[in-house]
């Protein structure tokens, strides 16, 4: 049930996961410097009911210059989930803005944990795309990506996304001007064939990953 | 735990400058996104500045645009919001807070003017008279 690869890249826009279905994997990554607590955990685990889900164990990085593991400890998953609701209730919170059901949200920070997060995600995890910075979106189609089983296979969608430059206005025949993402999907979900199309972008992420989910790191 | 604690808040003459000061210890400020919040009496939150930990891009809401600048200073984990020519509109709670970078250390500002923060500070409150 998890997802093979990695979603694709689009030049100038950057993805992110809303939430994260139940079965999604977070590796416990510290950064240069730091490493896990003795005996901490190695991943962090979405799991859950259709009614609440949260994040089982906990990441924790400690110096690797000290040999004493004492520090300060990180609340657990069912803490850090309460906190999180009572501010989604406080008044610089949008109430709308709750899980979910079935995914957990973006853990929140713990002290000196990777700069990059390392997900592993399961059959179903959608992930949003937008330009970044500078850039604006030209698409004819979902600026998002699925990652889907096909014939015992797991894919992720193409997201029809095109970022360019603020001063650029070069627009698709037959587009007046970007609009938000529809609903359907441009692509079949029963179909085997999957074609390249002059919108689908090589990922740049190294295709000699590891396979380990304790290991694979993103450059 | 990665706490935010904001400081600098106070009482302020119109056209008078403030500093707010945002500290995470902890943070791996190169994969977030940190910056300010503010929220007025019976007003919307709203997003008011940023600035990414990867390459330092900022953001800034039109109505602080000239201004306002936020830094950082990721060695003493924190954030600055220097706040100069205040008006009295510019009365608020002002919150710290941080999110997550998307792919490659990118960002986009639509996500923070969603206001869907990983961690928020306490707050703090700038007033300006006129």
């Known amino acids: 049930e998890l997802c093979d690869d990695d979603p694709p890249e689009i030049p100038h826009a950057t993805f992110k996961a809303m939430a994260y279905k139940e079965g999604t994997m977070l590796n416990c990554e510290c950064k240069r410097g730091f490493r896990r607590i003795k005996s901490g955990s190695l991943y962090m685990l979405c799991t859950g009911n259709s009614s609440h889900s949260s994040w089982d164990n906990q990441c924790q990085c400690t110096s690797s210059a000290t040999r004493n593991t004492t520090k300060q400890v990180t609340p657990q998953p069912e803490e850090q989930k309460e906190r999180k609701t009572t501010e989604m209730q406080s008044p610089m919170q949008p109430v709308d803005q709750a899980s979910l059901p079935g995914h957990c949200r973006e853990p929140p920070p713990w002290e000196n944990e990777a700069t990059e997060r390392i997900y592993h995600f399961v059959v179903g995890q959608m992930v949003y795309y937008q330009c970044v910075q500078g850039y604006r979106a030209l698409h004819r189609g979902p600026a998002e990506s699925v990652c889907k089983m096909t014939h015992g296979k797991t894919r992720w969608t193409q997201p029809q996304l095109i970022c360019t430059g603020e001063m650029e206005t070069s627009q698709f025949p037959g587009e007046e001007k970007p609009q938000a993402s529809p609903e359907g999907r441009p692509e079949s979900e029963t179909s085997c064939l999957v074609t390249t199309t002059d919108f689908q972008i090589q990922t740049e992420m190294a295709a000699t990953m590891e396979t380990s989910i304790f290991t694979t790191e993103y450059q | 735990q990665v706490q935010l604690v904001e400081s600098g808040g106070g009482l302020v003459q119109a056209g008078g400058s403030l500093r707010l000061s945002c500290t995470a210890s902890?943070?791996?400020?190169?994969?977030?996104?940190i910056g300010w919040f503010r929220q007025a009496p019976g007003k919307e939150r709203e997003g008011v500045s940023y600035?990414?930990?990867?390459?330092?891009?900022?953001y800034y809401i039109d109505s602080v645009k000239g201004r306002f600048t936020i830094s950082s200073d990721f060695a003493k984990s924190t954030v600055y919001l220097q706040m100069n020519n205040l008006k009295p509109e510019d009365t608020a709670v002002y919150y710290c807070?941080?999110?997550?970078?998307?792919?490659?250390?990118?960002?986009?500002?639509?996500?923070?003017?969603?206001?869907?923060?990983?961690?928020w500070g306490k707050g703090t409150l700038v007033t300006v008279s006129s």
């Open positions: 807070a941080v999110d997550r970078l998307g792919s490659r250390g990118g960002y986009a500002s639509s996500w923070w003017r969603s206001g869907d923060m990983d961690l």
């Open positions: 600035i990414t930990g990867s390459d330092a891009s900022t």
């Open positions: 902890g943070l791996t400020f190169e994969g977030y996104a």
